[in-house]
Amino acid sequence: QRLPRMQEDSPLGGGSSGEDDPLGEEDLPSEEDSPREEDPPGEEDLPGEEDLPGEEDLPEVKPKSEEEGSLKLEDLPTVEAPGDPQEPQNNAHRDKEGDDQSHWRYGGDPPWPRVSPACAGRFQSPVDIRPQLAAFCPALRPLELLGFQLPPLPELRLRNNGHSVQLTLPPGLEMALGPGREYRALQLHLHWGAAGRPGSEHTVEGHRFPAEIHVVHLSTAFARVDEALGRPGGLAVLAAFLEEGPEENSAYEQLLSRLEEIAEEGSETQVPGLDISALLPSDFSRYFQYEGSLTTPPCAQGVIWTVFNQTVMLSAKQLHTLSDTLWGPGDSRLQLNFRATQPLNGRVIEASFPAGVDSSPRAAEPVQLNSCLAAGD
């Protein structure tokens, strides 16, 4: 099923480039191109619990102290993701010598719950967002970011870790979700598909977008990522959908133009600091929010997901560069690096705006309106 033509004020209408006429249904890939529910998960690029790996390598985080014993997250192993026989090319993985279960990939055994029991948890990510069923919460105020406009120096590490491209962020990027919810940004990474196949992790009414950006944050209540894993609100991810638009996105080009340098799995390069907020939609007031998990092992729960309503526009060439430049280990292309959507299991997705109005292909059907659980400011 395809989305109807989206209006400017309807959920996910319009990209951050400010166009008034977002893509119509003829421009959107069909849902049949998306992986099935049992398809391989993608990664949220975070470290694992104890000796379990995370989805992406995170920098060492020591905001409260500089003790020598802090866990170096890049030293954590990674684990295997379950495979999908229908996605043989979707097998990017990262090997670490000397460990049993020391790597994970998109495709292949063992099943994730065997690697990390949390992957079989009830409150996993990503999920399908149904705007009609989202609970409008006026208490969800506009997000606030601080320090995201970075100077060219110092340069930042851009790395192909075998399952995504990740930009490590320096100290000082703060994000506020509301009362008692202050965070520091750690890294960002992307999820994508393949030629003609969308690759976002979250979906909207079953529609999968071409790609998705995740900016991963650690709560200021925790000094280190491993302390925050599995703790409610310990980690927070800002997520935005990437769509095809008519113009080149100059902010993304600063990263995409460097992908050839890190085509090989495990390679990295240094890029000048840039305006990280320019990689996100411009409308910080309209978003969906729910509590979920990391999207790869260890699949730790308690992660606050904030998914922007507005999309970000990239040119067709840029989306092609993203999905067709990087390689995983061996001769496998790094593509389709996303996890299938997970059941809500009673969770309510909250919206900072009245998302259910004229936004769903099933708008004519009776809808059970969910109530807002968020506390006021």
């Epitope: 606030e144 995201f148 703060e174 509301g178 009362p179 202050e182 907020s277 007031s285």
Partner: antibody, heavy 119, light 107 residues
């Protein structure tokens, strides 16, 4: 009602020190980012220093770095600004400001305390 | 540092007039802009946050708009009690910076 009351201002010679205090009431102080903002006579507003809710993150205006220290005592609901090596250009009305709960924008200001640096 | 250029520096208008104050940031600050009102002899008072969100208790004649680098504070129908200095502020990047202020006088 939110109330912020500054104190500790006064007349001091160049090179001298002062400690400003801001007593907060009417809200859960430990949940809020706080700042000191100053306004020189007849001039605009200038952020001097800021501190997050648990004191783990601080910021200083370049011209006061190394001379001023912002701190807070959440048990006493008090914000401080220790000022040393004072210069004539530090002469201003110093306001204590509270930020919106969990956010960076400021929503309440005290009435200010006057600092005059003069020989 | 991000410069916030506010204009005009002063204006005189009649009660009932529509008044517009603009603020231009030297670089993208997304929507991290606040507006404050400072009446003579008083501390600043909050008006707008996140560029366009009015604080509770602020009269609806005050509105804010803009994103990126260009921001506007509008008083739709000026009242006598609106005589004050108005300041914009960005809190997107340290150091948080204020505009130079706009003095609004009543004719």
């Amino acid at each position: 009602d939110v109330k912020l009351v500054e104190s500790g201002g006064g007349l001091v010679k160049p090179g001298g020190s002062l400690r400003l205090s801001c007593a907060a009431s009417g809200f859960t102080f430990s949940n809020y980012y706080m700042s000191w903002v100053r306004q020189a006579p007849g001039k605009g507003l200038e952020l001097v220093a800021a501190i997050n809710s648990d004191g783990g993150i601080t910021y200083y205006l370049d011209t006061v770095k190394g001379r001023f220290t912002i701190s807070r005592d959440n048990a006493k609901n008090t914000l401080y600004l220790q000022m040393s090596s004072l210069k004539s250009e530090d002469t201003a009305l110093y306001y204590c400001a509270r930020h919106r709960s969990g956010y960076f924008s400021m929503d309440y200001w005290g009435q200010g305390t006057s600092v005059t640096v003069s020989s | 540092d991000i410069q916030m250029t506010q204009s005009p520096s002063s204006l005189s208008a009649s009660v009932g007039d529509r008044v517009t104050i603009t603020c231009k940031a030297s670089q993208n600050v997304v929507s991290a802009v606040a507006w404050y009102q400072q009446k003579p002899g008083q501390a600043p008072r909050r008006l707008i946050y996140s560029a366009s969100n009015r604080y509770t208790g602020v009269p609806d004649r005050f509105s804010g708009s803009g994103s990126g680098t260009d921001f506007t504070l509008t008083i739709s129908s000026l009242q006598a009690e609106d005589l004050a200095d108005y300041y914009c502020q960005q809190y997107s990047n340290y150091p948080w910076t204020f505009g130079g202020g706009t003095k609004v006088e009543i004719k």
